[in-house]
């Protein structure tokens, strides 16, 4: 399975929407900065079978969807932008699920790399814990928005490799 060109476009649109979602200057939130420990090694893609890379990307997008579809998120971000954001994430999840289905039986390796998926979950668990500790403050959400934008940018490299991989 090769991810369609529309998947890359959707990823770029997702980043644009997240950029538009910013409401306060990041510079006013410098004291709230936090290292969430983005698992870069899970997105390098060199050691991956294709199906496993797809499952890791799927988990990251699913967790992003979960994070931004809470009532605390809805109270923070512009509703129109959030709806657009959900649409793009949903499109990407569908693309990856379609790809996953095609990969079943193609590779001898398991479809899901559970260990890699759990590493992604731990990363998102840290983000949700941070938001809880900061009582979902505007600056905390701003820090998280910037972090998710960064993680999407970093994962885009893996998506691009998947799209080109024969």
């Amino acid at each position: 399975c090769d991810l369609p060109q529309t998947h890359s476009l959707s990823n770029r649109r997702t980043l644009m929407i997240m950029a538009q979602m910013g409401r306060i200057s990041p510079f006013s939130c410098l004291k709230d900065r936090h290292d969430f420990g983005f698992p870069q090694e899970e997105f390098d893609g060199n050691q991956f079978q294709k199906a496993q890379a797809i499952s890791v990307l799927h988990e990251m997008i699913q967790q992003t969807f979960n994070l931004f579809s809470t009532k605390d998120s809805s109270a923070t971000w512009d509703e129109t932008l959030l709806d657009k954001f959900y649409t793009e994430l949903y499109q990407q999840l569908n693309d990856l699920e379609a790809c996953m289905m095609q990969e079943v039986g193609v590779e001898d390796t398991p479809l899901m790399n559970v260990d890699s998926i759990l590493t992604v979950r731990k990363y998102f668990q840290r983000i949700t814990l941070y938001l809880t500790e900061k009582k979902y403050s505007p600056c905390a959400w701003e820090v998280v928005r910037a972090e998710i934008m960064r993680s999407f940018s970093l994962s885009a490299n893996l998506q691009e490799r998947l799209r080109r991989k024969e």
Partner: antibody
């Protein structure tokens, strides 16, 4: 097969230091949280602390913070629990546990070590 | 801290009986309830996670239900192996907390 193998029993005097270990095998060490749980003989279970072996990020139960410390050695897939000055009240069985994390980010303890008995007595 | 209160603290039953243990949380923990069994001299073992999901390898005579502030563990057709102490746990908020335990012994 997932295994968490703990060191044997320890008998110590109050004020002494101690480090107990939990050697894990059978899975990717850096992908799962590890916690320590205390059980005072004949009593219930108390969660103490958890660590992400990937980068040693830790979360402590405030009741134990400052009295114990958790650490990992990735090269030998081992987690440690350490005291710098033991008290008689530290007498207990200590279990290391592996966390599983569901998609909705619910932690639960899916594998337990066999426990290490620590006896602190003068 | 979220307090977890189990009832009863102890109960007696016979092989083949059914028993129910209840756990109440001092505030809502959603479905972040888990149940463990501890046999004498052994480490606890996971039975049920996320209130109602049976851990792999655990017999179907164990069932969990509930969410919010209350959950229950039901054991049908008790086996000799089931006479042990049962603990509920919440992982919704830090610090994670356990119930005080329910000791199930032979009548």
């Amino acid at each position: 097969e997932v295994q968490l193998v703990q060191a044997g029993a320890e008998v110590k005097a109050p004020g002494e230091s101690l480090r107990i270990s939990c050697k894990v095998s059978g899975y990717t060490f850096t992908s799962y949280w590890i916690s320590w749980v205390r059980q005072i003989p004949g009593k219930g279970l108390e969660w103490m602390v958890k660590i992400d072996p990937r980068d040693s990020y830790t979360i402590y139960n405030p009741s134990f913070q400052g009295h114990v410390s958790i650490s990992v050695d990735k090269s030998i897939t081992t987690v440690y629990l350490q005291w710098s000055s033991l008290q008689a009240s530290d007498t207990a069985i200590y279990y290391c546990v592996r966390h599983y994390l569901t998609q909705s980010l619910v932690d639960y303890f899916d594998h337990w070590g066999q426990g290490t008995l620590v006896a602190v007595s003068s | 801290d979220i307090q977890m209160t189990q009832s009863p603290s102890s109960l007696s039953a016979s092989v083949g009986d059914s028993v129910t243990i209840t756990c109440r949380a001092s505030q809502s923990v959603s479905n972040y309830f888990h149940w463990y069994r501890q046999k004498p001299g052994k480490a606890p073992e996971l039975l049920i996670y996320s209130a109602s999901n049976l851990q792999t390898g655990v017999p179907s005579r164990f069932t969990g239900s509930g969410s919010g502030t209350e959950c229950t563990l039901t054991i049908t057709s008790l086996q000799p192996d089931d006479f042990a102490t049962y603990y509920c746990q919440q992982t919704h908020g830090y610090p994670f907390t356990f119930g005080q335990g329910t000791k199930l012994d032979v009548r």
